[in-house]
Structure formats: structure tokens, C-alpha cells
């Protein structure tokens, strides 16, 4: 039995299910109570809250058989309509074990803010209940298969089911997503949209123009061949209540990055430069790597052009192997699945001044015993303008004898090219090593020059800016 | 794409005033944005920049009257304490590259917004 | 300080004609070509017209053009038609100093 939405009002207009006098007055219950059944008017043998006694098998096979009455099968509305529906079952008077009655849909109790009443209506037979369902503003969610259960003397009772089914317009369930592609290359498009009503029949829109004449039932697959500029495509959803258009979503053609928007300098040593950038417009497709090309400044343009690549993510590269105190101009480009962005415009970058790359040369010591010290001399070491300005040197000397070991250094100004320093220990050996300093850093050490200092008569000495012997005893 | 400057209006002198630019067509997260003024009649005044990665760089002459600031979705311009010689018409404007604080080229202006300050 | 002086504060020209505007930086620009012209037609933002001296943005006629590097520039608008009749102005970007961009103090363009 199916009932369409003109004829719902009738539901609850009709008479009473059962045996029900005009004068009885019913009790009403809300859902959710579950207790047992409130007494009936007519004198009952025990209270319905209290255990009625255990009928024997062979009398509770006597029970005439209780079932739900037939009710509505199959409701059909619209969607934000209201809907009232209910189960009735006279339960007489030999049944003394009696539960409430609980609302079920597809397999599962509802519970809790659903709308639902329960009426008693007892006499002398025993007792007709009726339970309510309405449901206000009905949507897709409500559609599905309605039935009562109840426990009567421990045997559960289901009624029949009552289909209630939504109708309203399609309803899309899988839309057309953006998505990028590349020049004349085809791709798919899917789109779904359910009922009720079925079917539901599909068109597709392309710059808000239909693609296909003929409607294609859904679920539908739209293959675009191929295409040269953006385009915004949607697609329509037909049934008969009427018509549901799914978003329009942008095909967007994959084209070469923009070249980066931002290089920064972040640090500068002598012979490395920290690089920094912001990615242009991605073109579409994910950048993959970046290419920072590097050129001395001050060369003509015909100078070579060192390429750096590295992946694209972080936006930071540190170009080494660069000389000091040199200026660049330095540039970036990114490449995506098309190709490479133009070059970012060139932006210029100093290196530091470097460390001393040679040692001082023609190192010498001399033991002046009447003052106790060493006196050491060496020569400037041919600096080129990259390594810095002069501003000092470091010596080193290490103190060895049978049971002592000393090693220090001492500083001095550029200012000449000798220093003086006190004897550490007698009757050892003194290893003499000497860097040049400049702003940029500490250049290398010369090779070590060995003196013998004695206990306190002969001096043994080797002025050289070699490498001395370890023992200089003949 | 474009770029729309708003909130100039008339104010006392030393009533902060900020100005909003929003912009669409492309991401803020992508390039810096400078602001840009006009006097009545006048030339064009750089005030500063608003780089991705970097501090806000201003003109000498606007550090302290002015504060740069972005968001992901606006470039704000603050007039700390608006004088009458701050009447202009405000541009907020795209640079389509920058380093350190460099503007390269501005490539994108806005229509402007007019800012009258009087007592 | 960083400045851009356009000498001419005002030039006329002939429709069909050629006008040359030019621009002296002090110091010398980022890079020796980080300077760019624009256009400001009256009641209208400015629009860029050239940038690195002598690349001419998109959507530009080619009949403007632009040369120079370091400190001298100059910017040439062959073939003019009327409604090239606006101010336009030099800026440059500069690396010393805190003034990074300045704009030159414009120079009218009237076409007769």
C-alpha cells in the first residue's frame, strides 16, 4: 500500500484501530518511557507493574497470536514536507507481560530527539496502543525503513515496515574537481547525482555552454579531448523535480613558472654566499628544481655563468667555492613538468675578504741567552687583495723537554716582522710556527723551525724557514 | 588581477589613519607590495615596501610617520600622526621583483584612495 | 639621499612626432639598470612602461623605448599620438643608503 504526500493528512483522520469506545479517553506516554504498560480502566487480576504469574507452556500456546495491524506501507514526499505515520496493536487482557513499544529504521533503535507519542487506549478486552511518529521538515537523511517492536510475555513482535521516501531534487553525491592539465591533452570529468526521484539524467557545461545534447544517465564521464586556454566547466543534474547544477569548477592549462618575485642576500663569507628566494607563480605544477646562476660582476658580460641547481624546496641555497672579496651578480629560475621561468633580474653579492692563503716565509730563531729569549724573524708573505688587509700575525711555540710539554701563541701587529719571546724551559726543544692574520681570517702556519735551547751554556740554533730536523745534534 | 587600496577619508591632524589594499588575480604570499603617495597636484612619493621574506623597508624621510604591514590577505598602511602636509592620494602598488628591500619595477597600482587630513 | 632629476618639467611634441625625456641619477642605480618610466595619465594610477633601463612591459606599443645606464637615462616615444599626453615619470631602485626607490619629479608630455 502506497500513500502519495496528498493523502498524508489522512493518516491519523481515519477511526481507531481495534476495539476502542467512543467514551474511552486514551493515556498518552512520550517514546522514550519504556516501563510497562499503565493498568487499564477494567480491574485487572494483578497491577501491570507487578510480575504476573509464569503462564504454563501449554497455556501460552493457547494465547490467541498478537501481532501489529497493518498500517501504511510506502510514504512519498518531498523533501522539507512533514510526516506523521504510526503502528497500532491490541494487546487482550490473557497477556499479562507487557512492554513499550520502540521505533526502529534500517536496523536501528531511534532514540532520543525523535518525535514520537505513545497512546493507551484500554477496556474490558484489554488494551489497544498506538505509537506516533512525526518527523518536521523532512530531508534525504529521514529516507528509509520505518517499524515498531515490542515484547509481549518475552516474545519480541516487529511490525511491517513503513517505507518513507524523500523525494526532491538531484542531489550530487561526486561534483567535477579543478584540475590542471597540460596543452591539448585529454582528461575525464565525473559527475553523479542520486534521487529520489530516478533516474537522474546529467548534462555538461563548458564556459556556460552545454557540451552534450542528449542527457546521459548519472554517474557520468565527460572526456574533454584536449584544450588550449582555461576553461570552467559544471554539469547539470535533471530528475523529475527538477534541476540541481553542481559547482563550476576552473581547468586550468599548465604553462612555465613565473621567475621568482624575491632574492634576498642573506650572508656573505669569503668564498660562499647564502641565497634566499620567493617562487613566482607556480605555472600550475609544482615546482621540481631551481637553478641559481652565479657571475663575477666586474668581468665583462661575456664572462662564464656558474649554474647551481637544487631542489626547489627550501627557497635557499648556499653558493659556494666562490673567490674572496669578489662581487657577483647572481640570478634564479625555477623549472615545473613544462619548462623553465625566465631568469629573476640580476642582483649583485660580495664575498668577504679571505684568510692569508700562503704562510710567512723565511722564518728564523735565535737564542739570545744574556737576555733569556728567542728572537724570531720572518717575512711578509705575498698577500693578494682577496686574502685582505694585514693586520697581524700569530706565533706558535711549543715547548718540549723530558718531562714537560708547553704549547702557546702569541699576537703581534703587522707593524715589522719580528717578535721577541721569553725562553719557556730550559733544555728542551722549541718548535716555532708562524700564520699571517687579516679581517678575513687566520692564514695557514709555516713549517715548523726547531731550536735546542741548552741548560745554560751552548746554544744550538736553525735559523730556516724549513723544516727542521727533530734533533739538530751533529 | 588587480589591486584596490580603501579608508581615506578626511581626519584631524593626529588622528591615526590606516589604509587597507586587497588585492585579486594573485597571492600576497607571492610578491611585495609598496605604498605610494600622490600629493594634490603633485609628483610621486615612494614611502616603502613590504617584502615576502623580509623586515619593511621605508624611505628615510617616512620612517616613524608610516608603519607597513601585511597579512595573507591585506597590505595595511598606517599614518602614525597624520599631518596636513600628509594629504595625498595613497597608491598601494605590486613589485614584480625585489631584493633586500630593492624594488625592481612596480608593475600593478591601484586606483588609490584620498587622504585629506584638516582641521 | 638618492635622487632622480628630470630636467624638463614639461616637453611638447607634434602628433606623429618624436619626444625624448630625460633622467640623471645620483648615485648611480642598482645594478646600473634598475630604472623604469611611467606613464600618469590625469585622474588615472601611474602605469609601467619600461623597466631595466630599456625593456619594454607587457602590453607597451614598441614606439616607446628606453636606453641608458649608471646615472643617465632617457626615455623616447617615437611616432606620438594624442593620447600619450600625460606626465611621466623616471624611478629607480638603489642599493646605498636606506632610500632603496625613488621616483624623478615627472615631466609633462603636451601634444599638439
Known amino acids: 500500500e502506497k500513500w502519495e504526500e496528498t493523502e498524508l493528512d489522512q493518516l491519523f483522520s481515519g477511526p481507531l484501530p481495534g476495539r476502542l469506545p467512543v467514551n474511552h479517553r486514551p493515556f498518552s506516554a512520550p517514546h522514550s518511557s519504556r516501563d510497562q504498560l499503565p493498568p487499564p480502566q477494567t480491574g485487572r487480576s494483578h497491577p501491570a507493574h507487578t510480575a504476573a504469574p509464569q503462564v504454563t507452556s501449554t497455556a501460552s500456546k493457547l494465547l490467541p497470536p498478537v501481532a501489529f495491524n497493518h498500517t501504511i506501507g510506502h510514504i512519498v514526499l518531498s523533501e522539507h514536507k512533514n510526516v506523521k505515520f504510526n503502528c497500532s496493536i491490541n494487546i487482550p487482557n490473557t497477556y499479562q507481560e507487557t512492554a513499550g513499544i520502540s521505533w526502529w529504521k534500517d536496523g536501528k533503535e531511534l532514540l532520543g530527539a525523535h518525535h514520537s507519542i505513545t497512546q493507551f487506549y484500554p477496556d474490558e478486552e484489554g488494551v489497544s496502543i498506538i505509537a506516533l511518529f512525526s518527523i518536521a521538515s523532512v530531508q534525504r537523511s529521514d529516507n528509509g525503513s520505518y517499524f515498531c517492536k515490542m515484547k509481549v510475555n518475552n516474545r519480541e513482535i516487529v511490525s511491517d515496515p513503513i517505507y518513507v521516501e524523500v523525494q526532491g531534487l538531484p542531489y550530487f553525491i561526486k561534483q567535477p574537481e579543478s584540475v590542471n592539465v597540460t596543452r591539448n591533452t585529454a582528461f575525464n570529468l565525473t559527475c553523479q547525482a542520486v534521487g529520489p526521484p530516478e533516474p537522474v539524467n546529467i548534462f555538461w557545461v563548458q564556459n556556460s555552454s552545454r557540451v552534450n545534447e542528449k542527457p546521459e544517465r548519472s554517474p557520468s564521464v565527460l572526456t574533454v579531448p584536449g584544450l588550449t586556454e582555461t576553461a570552467v566547466f559544471s554539469c547539470e543534474a535533471h530528475n523529475d523535480k527538477g534541476l540541481t547544477v553542481s559547482k563550476g569548477v576552473h581547468i586550468n592549462i599548465k604553462v612555465i613558472p613565473s621567475p621568482p618575485t624575491e632574492v634576498h642576500i642573506l650572508n656573505s663569507t669569503a668564498h660562499s654566499i647564502l641565497v634566499s628566494w620567493v617562487p613566482g607563480f607556480d605555472g600550475y605544477s609544482p615546482l621540481q628544481n631551481c637553478s641559481i646562476q652565479v657571475k663575477e660582476a666586474d668581468r665583462l658580460s661575456n664572462g662564464s655563468v656558474m649554474v647551481f641547481n637544487t631542489s626547489a624546496s627550501p627557497h635557499l641555497y648556499e653558493i659556494q667555492q666562490l673567490q674572496a672579496l669578489a662581487n657577483y651578480s647572481i640570478a634564479v629560475s625555477c623549472r615545473n613538468e613544462i619548462g623553465w621561468s625566465a631568469v629573476s633580474p640580476w642582483i649583485l653579492a660580495s664575498t668577504t675578504e679571505g684568510a692569508p692563503s700562503v704562510a710567512p716565509l723565511n722564518i728564523t730563531v735565535f737564542l739570545n741567552e744574556s737576555n733569556n729569549i728567542l728572537d724570531i724573524r720572518w717575512t711578509k708573505p705575498p698577500i693578494k687583495r682577496q686574502d685582505g688587509e694585514l693586520v697581524g700575525y700569530r706565533i706558535s711555540h711549543v715547548w718540549e723537554s723530558a718531562g714537560t710539554y708547553k704549547e702557546l701563541s702569541e699576537e703581534v701587529s703587522q707593524n715589522g716582522s719580528w717578535a721577541q719571546i721569553p725562553v719557556q724551559i730550559h733544555n728542551a726543544t722549541c718548535t716555532v710556527r708562524i700564520a699571517a692574520i687579516t679581517k678575513g681570517g687566520i692564514g695557514p702556519f709555516s713549517e715548523p723551525v726547531n731550536i735546542i735551547i741548552p741548560e745554560h751554556s751552548k746554544v744550538d740554533y736553525a735559523p730556516s724557514s724549513t723544516p727542521a730536523p727533530g734533533n739538530t745534534d751533529s | 588581477q588587480s589591486v584596490e587600496e580603501s579608508g581615506g577619508r578626511l581626519v584631524t591632524p593626529g588622528t591615526p589613519l590606516t589604509l587597507t589594499c586587497t588585492v585579486s588575480g594573485f597571492s600576497l604570499s607571492t610578491y611585495s607590495m609598496s605604498w605610494v603617495r600622490q600629493a594634490p597636484g603633485k609628483g610621486l612619493e615612494w614611502l616603502g615596501i613590504?617584502?615576502?621574506?623580509?623586515d619593511p623597508v621605508y624611505a628615510t624621510w617616512a620612517r616613524g610617520r608610516f608603519t607597513i604591514s601585511r597579512t595573507s590577505t591585506t597590505v595595511n598602511l598606517k599614518i602614525t600622526s597624520p599631518t596636513t602636509e600628509d594629504t595625498a592620494t595613497y597608491f598601494c602598488?605590486?613589485?614584480?621583483?625585489?631584493?633586500?628591500?630593492?624594488?625592481?619595477?612596480?608593475?600593478?597600482w591601484g586606483q588609490g584612495t584620498l587622504v585629506t587630513v584638516s582641521s | 639621499a638618492q635622487v632622480l632629476t628630470q630636467t624638463a618639467s614639461s616637453v611638447s611634441a607634434a602628433v606623429g612626432g618624436t619626444v625624448t625625456i630625460s633622467c640623471q641619477s645620483s648615485p648611480s642605480v642598482y645594478n646600473h639598470n634598475w630604472l623604469s618610466w611611467y606613464q600618469q595619465k590625469p585622474g588615472q594610477p601611474p602605469k609601467l612602461l619600461i623597466y631595466?633601463?630599456?625593456k619594454l612591459a607587457s602590453g607597451v606599443p614598441s614606439r616607446f623605448s628606453g636606453s641608458g645606464s649608471g646615472t643617465q637615462f632617457t626615455l623616447t616615444i617615437s611616432d606620438v599620438q594624442c593620447d600619450e599626453a600625460a606626465t611621466y615619470y623616471c624611478a629607480g631602485g638603489f642599493s646605498s643608503g636606506s632610500d632603496s626607490f625613488a621616483f624623478g619629479g615627472g615631466t609633462e608630455v603636451v601634444v599638439t
Open positions: 631595466e633601463a630599456s
Open positions: 602598488v605590486r613589485v614584480a621583483f625585489s631584493t633586500n628591500g630593492i624594488p625592481h619595477r612596480l608593475d600593478l
Open positions: 613590504v617584502s615576502v621574506a623580509i
